[in-house]
């Protein structure tokens, strides 16, 4: 029997009597920014080097009694979760600790910044293998802390942080809200979001994935052989830091973008009960629980994609929302979603030399989200082909006309406020998979990509009667790159990708008559690249 | 107050500095902004991170910090530079009165200023 959390993150093929996956992260150094730690604890002795970095505020209260074991409690436990001999995730990883939290578990943004700077300087002075930085802390949204995390991430460091224990939108906290950081929420043994007193794990679009974070057994600072169970998003983040160390040890050349995509890809999908989250956050919160890959090698040939939601646009008439991919990722499609259904679609546009996904709110709308499908596609050459609104009644169409380019996504946006009202649906002619179609009042945008061995196909699922949700999934071996609704359905709230499934949402069916307008068709573009392994070798 | 002598020593150095001129107007068309934590109990007024524009060199950061000290001293305010950032972000950490924010925002190379705030173990 092994602790539930280690069992949960271990793929079945590793599960023996004891948790001993191959290569315990020995090529990786994990930096921990936390409280002081008890480095002579049996779990972490010889594995954790305590740096001389310390930047902490005074403890609150005049009668505060500094007790070493309490001062070390949080950091010691987390060091144990990451690399502990008996209860750690990455038993081979070496760690370095920086003290940025005082004996009450409190620190400052400035102290954390100076700590991150210390790590960057250490990296420059003595470059080692891959670095993982664990930030098991949270404060209010901080532009400067997020900016520092971005800089460190762009220097090749993997940052993992706690989503926060405030039962709130993680985007309101830092460093959880930094896009470059891997932000981790907490789940329990039942794969449910963790409740902590009256609060609990944070959630929302700024969370990348969840990991075990309740009743986690680890090193206790009460004695050098003591164990303790603790709960929180810090513990969840420590699991992901350990998994990241394992992955990087197996594949030291992985970029942050590749690592994040793999973490998402190998996670357990759709196991979290979303009813725990506020209704408006459910669609934005990833239903993913972290796990080690079943094999540390051989994932290179797969086409990895993830869904990135924008912040909410706000309700003003001309409001827009922008979703961006990471620097190493390709934007392969763009969709939009509005709870009120009032939106003016979306488009892919260039911004600072990169494509972004922009969604447009409509008059009377409560606001929109832009949803980007961000993929790892080495040697890709992607462009957007646009067709302005058509005069013909057949609607607007655009296709990928360049030799070797395949269609990866379709978007449409329109200036009129109520596109499609009293208009019959426009059907896409069969046998033309490289074509996007739309209303004659809409501009249609096709994302067209050329990459070695890339092939794509269109898959549709239509339901004649109105339904709140229509889905279509890509089969095994294919990856969803594009997700949209076939035009002609005026009550569509939008489309978005959830893992490998395209979801098209409609207004509550009770408000929609079952006319032909009620028909809803979800269109998925499914791609694969059987040459990604060779392509990545060629790049190296 | 702790380290008062140190503060005065810094102040004297700042007053002697050749940077004791009026602040140059920030680059045309850009206005530095001020940010603070939305959660009031977590705010730490009196300590500020002054973030400078991306390509600012360490020497310029130090010069900007000294200029702020000099101008603050001329207005009768004591300031203390707690740290000069370089390696990740150019800028500096300063202990000063909130009254000086307007002045600091007008310094050359300043991108934005953020009031320090608390972070917590999770």
């Amino acid at each position: 029997s092994i602790p539930w959390n280690l069992e949960r993150i271990t793929p079945p093929r590793y599960r023996a009597d004891e948790y001993q996956p191959p290569d315990g992260g020995s090529l990786v150094e994990v930096y921990l920014l936390d409280t002081s730690i008890q480095s002579d604890h049996r779990e972490i002795e010889g594995r954790v080097m305590v740096t001389d970095f310390e930047n902490v505020p005074e403890e609150d209260g005049t009668r505060f009694h500094r007790q070493a074991s309490k001062c070390d409690s949080h950091g010691t436990h987390l060091a144990g979760v990451v690399s502990g001999r008996d209860a750690g995730v990455a038993k081979g990883a070496s760690m370095r600790s920086l003290r940025v939290l005082n004996c009450q578990g409190k620190g400052t943004v400035s102290g954390t910044l100076i700590g991150l700077e210390f790590i960057r300087k250490s990296q420059l002075v003595q470059p080692v293998g891959p670095l993982v930085v664990l930030l098991p802390l949270a404060g209010g949204y901080s532009r400067v802390l997020n900016a520092a995390c971005q800089r460190l991430a762009r220097a090749g460091v993997v940052l993992v942080t706690a989503a926060g224990n405030f039962r709130d939108d993680a985007c309101l906290y830092s460093p959880a809200s930094a896009p470059e950081v891997i932000t981790v929420g907490a789940t329990n043994a039942q794969d449910q979001p963790v409740t902590l007193g009256t609060l609990g794990t944070n959630f929302g679009r700024c969370v990348d994935l969840f990991a075990p974070g309740e009743d986690i057994i680890g090193a206790s600072s009460d004695c050098s052989t003591c164990f303790v169970s603790q709960s929180g998003t810090s513990q969840a983040a420590a699991h992901v830091a350990g998994i990241a160390a394992m992955m990087l040890s197996a594949e030291p050349e992985l970029t942050l973008a590749e690592l994040r995509q793999r973490l998402i890809h190998f996670s357990a999908k759709d196991v979290i009960n979303e009813a725990w989250f506020p209704e408006d956050q459910r669609v934005l919160t990833p239903n993913l629980v972290a796990a080690l890959p079943p094999s540390t090698h051989g994932a290179g040939w797969q086409l990895f994609c993830r869904t990135v939601w924008s912040a909410h646009s706000g309700p003003t008439r001309m409001a827009t929302a922008v979703a961006r991919c990471a620097p190493d990722e390709e934007l392969l499609s763009c969709s939009s979603f509005s709870r009120s259904g009032k939106r003016r679609g979306e488009r892919m546009e260039a911004q600072g030399g990169k494509l972004v996904c922009r969604a447009h709110n409509a008059f009377g709308g409560e606001g929109v989200y832009a949803i980007a499908r961000c993929c790892l596609l080495p040697q890709a050459n992607c462009s957007v082909h646009t067709a302005p609104p058509a005069e013909a009644s057949m609607g607007t169409r655009v296709h990928c006309h360049q030799q070797g380019h395949v269609l990866t996504g379709c978007s449409s946006h329109w200036e009129v406020e109520d596109l499609g009202t009293h208009k019959p649906p426009v059907l896409r002619p069969r046998g033309q998979p490289n074509q996007c179609v739309g209303h004659r009042e809409a501009s249609i945008h096709a994302s067209c990509c050329h990459a070695p061995g890339l092939e794509c196909k269109v898959k549709e699922h239509g339901i004649p009667a109105p339904q709140e949700q229509v889905t279509v999934a890509c089969e095994e071996g294919w990856t969803l790159t594009g997700c949209s609704a076939l035009p002609g359905t005026s009550h569509v709230l939008g489309a978005y990708a959830v893992d490998n499934t395209c979801v098209v949402r409609s207004r509550d069916v009770s408000t929609t008559g079952s006319t032909s307008e009620g028909a809803v068709t979800a269109v998925a573009i499914c791609c694969r690249s059987r040459h990604l392994a060779q392509a990545s070798q060629e790049l190296q | 107050q702790e380290d008062e002598d140190g503060d005065y020593e810094e102040l004297v150095l700042a007053l002697r500095s050749e940077e004791d001129g009026l602040a140059e107007a920030p680059e045309h068309g850009t206005t530095a902004t001020f940010h603070r934590c939305a959660k009031d109990p977590w705010r730490l007024p009196g300590t500020y991170v002054v973030v400078l524009k991306e390509e600012t060199h360490l020497s310029q950061s130090e010069r900007t910090a000294r200029r702020l000290q000099a101008q603050a001293a001329r207005r009768g305010y004591l300031t203390k530079i707690l740290h000069v950032f370089h390696g990740l972000l150019p800028g500096f950490l300063v202990k000063m009165s909130g009254d000086l924010l307007e002045l600091a925002l007008k310094l050359p190379h300043v991108d934005y200023i953020e009031e320090d705030s608390s972070v917590f173990a999770q």
Epitope: P3, S73, H74, D222, T225, S229 | -
Partner: antibody, heavy 131, light 106 residues
């Protein structure tokens, strides 16, 4: 309150092995660690090793390394201690003892401390090694 | 291994006496020390844990103090049922016990 009930007295020949059992009742077995402590006639207490069923790992005192095996069976709430290559100086009363657990709050969380603090003991099993 | 040395190894006292037993660790063990009482033919009983915390159900005449290397068990007013052998035990490393202190009737 957890009760620990041990198996009966044993007489063994030198060079043989003995396996003593310790059954827990009245508590959640898997949330408690079990240690084994022995006491030779007229002597003090000596810790041999312990198992923490949550971690699924056993820890042994250097002196007994390689000679003692501690296991636990969660389905029957029973811990076992097997000592091999017995010699006359292994004649002693062998006790199983449960590690204590307390629950406190830190950072707004519940924390369970598992440590070598022996709050409940078995009645002891006398093992006599004699030719 | 951490060595624990108890003193005295035995003492004679009368009912109502204040009794002090000391325990010294060969290296610093924080507050990771427990005290036990053992009566003939019985299993030990936990009295004090973590250096100074009284185990529930144990009379308040028993108290513990100390941290680091030097620890003390005090019985403020010896009762007839207190005549027994007392052991200290550290748990900072693998557990080790002191050799015991026998408290006998004078």
């Amino acid at each position: 309150q957890v009760q620990l009930v041990q198996s009966g007295a044993e007489v063994k020949k030198p060079g043989s092995s003995v396996k003593v059992s310790c059954k827990a009742s009245g508590g959640t077995f898997n949330s408690h660690a079990i240690s084994w402590v022995r006491q030779a006639p007229g002597q003090g207490l000596e810790w041999m090793g312990g198992i923490n069923p949550i971690l699924g790992i056993a820890n042994y005192a250097q002196k007994f390394q390689g000679r003692v095996t501690i296991t636990a069976d969660e389905s029957t709430s029973t811990a076992y201690m097997e000592l091999s290559s017995l010699r006359s100086e292994d004649t002693a009363v062998y006790y199983c003892a449960r590690h204590y657990e307390i629950q406190i709050g830190r950072y707004g969380m519940n924390v369970y401390y598992l440590m070598y603090r022996f709050a409940s003991w078995g009645q002891g099993t006398l093992v006599t090694v004699s030719s | 291994d951490i060595q624990m040395t108890q003193s005295p190894s035995s003492l004679s006292a009368s009912v109502g006496d204040r009794v002090t037993i000391t325990c010294r660790a060969s290296q610093g063990i924080r507050s990771a020390l427990n005290w036990y009482q053992q009566k003939p033919g019985k299993a030990p009983k936990l009295l004090i844990y973590q250096g100074s915390t009284l185990q529930s159900g144990v009379p308040s005449r028993f108290s513990g103090s100390g941290s680091g290397t030097d620890f003390t068990l005090t019985i403020s007013s010896l009762q007839p049922e207190d005549f027994a052998v007392y052991y200290c035990q550290q748990f900072d490393g693998d557990p080790t016990f002191g050799q015991g202190t026998k408290v006998e009737i004078k």
